[in-house]
Amino acid sequence: CKAMHVAQPAVVLASSRGIASFVCEYASPGKATEVRVTVLRQADSQVTEVCAATYMMGNELTFLDDSICTGTSSGNQVNLTIQGLRAMDTGLYICKVELMYPPPYYLGIGNGTQIYVIDPEPCPDSDF
């Protein structure tokens, strides 16, 4: 089978500052030199793109300047960080990997990581 398998953790809890990190790992059926990684969010049956980056193997992963994602790559493993998350952003985040070059193209879609985000409690006023 020449399909590409993508693995990601089932559950991640965001930090109190609204930052969530997880690893997306893919088993490449070919020797890709150019890879695109996309984070998708699935809510109900709607899928939206959170962020995307294309990188050359051996080089760093670069998201757009205004992206809420950052990441690093090492071999067939991508370490993804999503920032600025709030409780309403809790949901299933899917890692999608595409081997862009050289041909043939391959698509890999993970099962998704459920990211839980809890808004921090406001600090109570303190009287001294």
Epitope: T48, P104, L107
Partner: antibody
Framework: QVQLVESGGGVVQPGRSLRLSCAAS????????MHWVRQAPGKGLEWVAV????????HYADSVKGRFTISRDNSKNTLYLQMNSLRAEDTAVYYC???????????WGQGTMVTVSS | EIVLTQSPGTLSLSPGERATLSCRAS???????LAWYQQKPGQAPRLLIY???SRATGIPDRFSGSGSGTDFTLTISRLEPEDFAVYYC?????????FGPGTKVDIK
């Protein structure tokens, strides 16, 4: 709403060229791969070519490799198919289709007919 | 190249009946990358099912998909008059993207 509209089809002689266009609206064009799929009269669907995102990566079916060129202009939200050295067997309805975020072809144009005949 | 074959070529049924369409791949296809499309005469194809079993937006629940490996099935639980059409399976996990030859569902 999300829409794809093809144009540029017509009748052309064997060996000649034709350029098809596909105007996209209602979505962020640059965020999607775009395909051309064709259907010969009374036949099934045949994938022709795909162009990804910024246009730097393209893949073609063997039947059109070296003759057809797919391109896109993200500033104009338009997809193109330049068809050279046309043959009778290229006669078909040509559809443009959006590569959905999950991979399947989720939006299709209405198609444009190309007839290669002397 | 992954070759897809569909059976039967034509399925003659009456409204209200159950339709079962088969798609077989020449090599294993991950179920994540198998789709079904419906096409009516003079119209463009329409995505019904992706990921072998997930319904596309706006597709009624009488359409369902199943299968894994090399064998996939599209089931229409109760045929409505508007369901008589040609159905294609497709793999989109690797290029070249390939379609099956189609199954025509017509009125008995």
């Amino acid at each position: 709403q999300v829409q794809l509209v093809e144009s540029g089809g017509g009748v052309v002689q064997p060996g000649r060229s034709l350029r098809l266009s596909c105007a996209a609206s209602g979505f962020t064009f640059r965020s999607y791969g775009m395909h051309w799929v064709r259907q010969a009269p009374g036949k099934g669907l045949e994938w022709v070519a795909v162009i990804w995102y910024d246009g730097s990566n393209k893949h073609y079916a063997d039947s059109v490799k070296g003759r057809f060129t797919i391109s896109r202009d993200n500033s104009k939200n338009t997809l193109y198919l330049q068809m050279n050295s046309l043959r009778a067997e290229d006669t078909a309805v040509y559809y443009c289709a959006r590569n959905g975020l999950i991979g399947a072809f989720d939006i299709w144009g209405q198609g444009t007919m190309v007839t290669v005949s002397s | 190249e992954i070759v897809l074959t569909q059976s039967p070529g034509t399925l003659s049924l009456s409204p209200g009946e159950r339709a079962t369409l088969s798609c077989r791949a020449s090599q294993s296809v991950s179920s994540s990358y198998l789709a079904w499309y419906q096409q009516k005469p003079g119209q463009a194809p329409r995505l019904l099912i992706y990921g072998a079993s997930s319904r596309a937006t706006g597709i009624p629940d009488r359409f369902s998909g199943s299968g894994s490996g090399t064998d996939f099935t599209l089931t229409i639980s109760r045929l409505e008059p508007e369901d008589f059409a040609v159905y294609y399976c497709q793999q989109y996990g690797s290029s070249p993207f390939t379609f099956g030859p189609g199954t025509k569902v017509d009125i008995k």
